[in-house]
């Protein structure tokens, strides 16, 4: 058993059938010695009586808020979580395997630049009873600081018959230099509680490899006289590291209709313009990527061909 | 401490291509070790992260973008002396930051020419001959340092006297082609920065 | 199985016209770019032209500016490139392409065999 | 025009070592370079698209690589039905170039 924040501590249990569970030991926050009586959750039934209470837990019915009273005043609460192991795997119920890069990946991370700030997420089908905490540091052994905010639901989704529920949450390396060269990862871990039940989750990371920059921005075309080439141009996303002489992009340009599986024009470019032949009815569209670190390209930023 | 903006002119700055043809190469050779040693702990999240140039170089810091100079984070640096004579250097006028910056690099290739150099005599005696050093990494290597163009001291090939672990050194050449790949990227940056000023 | 079949080979005189024909097979005609391309004897590749059968857009190589016209009939799924005004250097096997791709072929014709002579 | 020069234009090659074959750009074409293989009477077939991309159904030991004016085809080990005529082609503007064919022969 271990501590999450004051008065609320997890209990680790091997889950399998008929498994012996875990001998808690717990003490009432009191100077009192005398006439103290126990209660869990909402029943009024007196578990025990005595400044300690030891009870064997086992299954989730055995967790909940255990409160200490004397006299019919509350004295002190102890929340107790589950955090179930199966075969030796800690559980993974409340978060959804998002499954890309790799199979188990739960929590999913980006970058804009080289800031040192990111956004992590993570999906769920859970909608109520649940809260989220996470934590983050520059390597493990000597953590360096990161700063996150607080976990906010940022989607909504309807997949088939189940709502999905997207949470994210910004996190900031205190002290970053965007040309640094990193040799230790960012870890970031995410504690999720749903009832009475506690999972945790972990990432790690160098920012370098979760590069995505924004789409390219002020897309614009210029027809070429006599041909049915166009010119078009761009500029670097506002949020991409500066200078960008230093902190270069490659683009990739192309011209497709609506349908993926129709003709298209493609050509990858180090410039911001590039020439390409426009068709009735396509669009031209541009995305970026680290021109020498291969990480994610962006989303693509589209104009009309017309 | 930092890059100045007055620096040589796009034409006369031989070392950009050098640099981009070194990228690629090491990039390559790291793609075909993570395919020949598939086996072996050689991806980014399998490896320690390892720099054989801490504290006896300081090209992220010697070559740092003027913009970044501003901030606090990027200005810890360790100040090592260099000698300033490189043909990269297009102009007198160049600083004497951009020349340490230059020499830094040309201390970085050196000593990992050094190292990939006795890694590939110890990969040569394997009798499993499963992974040799791409020559033309060495070649590209070798180019860059030529075209930086330093006087230094000439570090000597280290010779290993007891029978090799070919284990560790496919590990140590993982851990060598992973840290590399990322001085390159700086390399890169700092010849893309240094071409466009 | 996508293939480009090209007629037969040609003989023509200086200052004569050939059209070289390039019939295709699986896929839907309209739904690739369609490409001519030469090589003459002992020489590389040389890109002529292209054209979108879905519109009859087409755009040449300057070179061939003038000389050559791209033509394509859907309902029979061919290509046509007829090349005008020939001279010696024009003998050459003519190459059809295809793909969905409009920089690059993953298709190509047999090639036909053009000799121009007197 | 963006001429595209090939080296060696004659590769003699021993069935079953490696070949590099490379290909330049007289400006800097990005990764906008295919490479092809050719034949004696028979259509040309693309192997490796935009550099290093491989194409499905072509052999593993085909590879590309490279940027801006330099790049290099691979062939990690010659198989007898390797020897052809290589050709590499531009697709950064128009009009298309190609290089002038590297021929890999039996050594």
């Known amino acids: 058993i271990w501590e999450l924040k004051k008065d609320v501590y997890v209990v680790e249990l091997d889950w399998y059938p008929d498994a012996p569970g875990e001998m808690v030991v717990l003490t009432c926050d009191t100077p009192e010695e005398d006439g103290i009586t126990w209660t869990l959750d909402q029943s009024s039934e007196v578990l025990g009586s005595g400044k300690t209470l030891t009870i064997q837990v086992k299954e989730f019915g055995d967790a909940g808020q255990y409160t200490c009273h004397k006299g019919g005043e509350v004295l002190s609460h102890s929340l107790l979580l589950l955090h179930k192991k199966e075969d030796g795997i800690w559980s993974t119920d409340i978060l959804k395997d998002q499954k890309e890069p790799k199979n188990k990946t739960f929590l999913r991370c980006e970058a804009k630049n080289y800031s040192g700030r990111f956004t992590c997420w993570w999906l769920t089908t859970i909608s109520t009873d649940l809260t989220f905490s996470v934590k983050s540091s520059r390597g493990s052994s000597d953590p360096q600081g990161v700063t996150c905010g607080a976990a906010t639901l940022s989607a909504e989704r309807v997949r088939g018959d189940n709502k999905e529920y997207e949470y994210s949450v910004e996190c900031q390396e205190d002290s970053a230099c965007p040309a640094a060269e990193e040799s230790l990862p960012i870890e970031v871990m995410v504690d999720a509680v749903h009832k009475l039940k506690y999972e945790n989750y972990t990432s790690s990371f160098f920012i370098r490899d979760i590069i995505k920059p924004d789409p390219p921005k002020n897309l614009q075309l210029k027809p070429l006289k006599n041909s049915r080439q166009v010119e078009v141009s761009w500029e670097y996303p506002d949020t991409w590291s500066t200078p960008h002489s230093y902190f270069s992009l490659t683009f990739c340009v192309q011209v497709q209709g609506k349908s993926k599986r129709e003709k298209k024009d493609r050509v990858f470019t180090d410039k911001t313009s590039a020439t390409v032949i426009c068709r009735k009815n396509a669009s031209i569209s541009v995305r970026a990527q680290d021109r020498y670190y291969s990480s994610s390209w962006s989303e693509w930023a589209s104009v009309p061909c017309s | 401490r930092n890059l100045p903006v007055a620096t040589p002119d796009p034409g006369m700055f031989p070392c950009l291509h050098h640099s981009q043809n070194l990228l690629r190469a090491v990039s390559n050779m790291l793609q075909k070790a993570r395919q020949t040693l598939e086996f072996y702990p050689c991806t980014s999240e399998e490896i320690d992260h390892e720099d054989i140039t801490k504290d006896k170089t300081s090209t992220v810091e010697a070559c740092l973008p003027l913009e970044l100079t501003k901030n606090e984070s990027c200005l810890n640096s360790r100040e090592t002396s260099f000698i300033t004579n490189g043909s990269c250097l297009a102009s007198r006028k160049t600083s004497f930051m951009m020349a340490l910056c230059l020499s830094s690099i040309y201390e970085d290739l050196k000593m990992y020419q050094v190292e990939f150099k006795t890694m590939n005599a110890k990969l040569l005696m394997d009798p499993k001959r499963q992974i040799f050093l791409d020559q033309n990494m060495l070649a590209v290597i070798d180019e860059l340092m030529q075209a930086l163009n330093f006087n230094s001291e000439t570090v000597p090939q280290k010779s290993s006297l007891e029978e090799p672990d070919f284990y560790k050194t496919k590990i140590k050449l993982c851990i060598l082609l992973h840290a590399f790949r990322i001085r390159a990227v700086t390399i890169d940056r700092v010849m893309s920065y240094l071409n466009a000023s | 199985q996508v293939q480009l079949v090209q007629s037969g080979a040609e003989v023509k005189k200086p200052g004569s016209s050939v059209k070289v024909s390039c019939k295709a097979s699986g896929g839907t005609f309209s739904d690739y770019y369609l490409h001519w391309s030469r090589q003459a004897p002992g020489q590389g590749l040389e890109w002529m032209g292209w054209i979108d059968p879905e519109n009859g857009d087409t755009e040449y190589a300057p070179k061939f500016q003038g000389r050559v016209t791209i033509t394509a009939d859907e309902s029979t799924s061919t290509a046509y490139m007829e090349l005008s005004s020939l001279r010696s250097e024009d003998t050459a096997v003519y190459y059809c392409a295809r793909n969905k791709e409009l920089r690059y072929f993953d298709v190509w014709g047999q090639g036909t065999l053009v000799t121009v002579s007197s | 025009d963006i001429v595209m020069t090939q080296s060696p234009l004659s590769l003699p090659v021993t069935p079953g070592e490696p070949a590099s074959i490379s290909c330049r750009a007289s400006q800097s074409i990005s990764i906008n370079l295919h490479w092809y293989q050719q034949k004696p009477g028979q259509a040309a077939r693309l192997l490796i698209a935009?550099?290093?991309q491989s194409i499905s159904g072509v052999p593993s030991r085909f590879s590309g690589s490279g940027s801006g004016t330099d790049f290099t085809l691979t062939i990690s080990s010659l198989q007898p039905e390797d020897f052809a005529t290589y050709y590499c082609?531009?697709?950064?503007?128009?009009?298309?170039?190609f290089g002038q064919g590297t021929k890999v022969e039996i050594k």
């Open positions: 082609q531009q697709s950064n503007s128009f009009p298309l170039t």
């Open positions: 935009f550099a290093s």
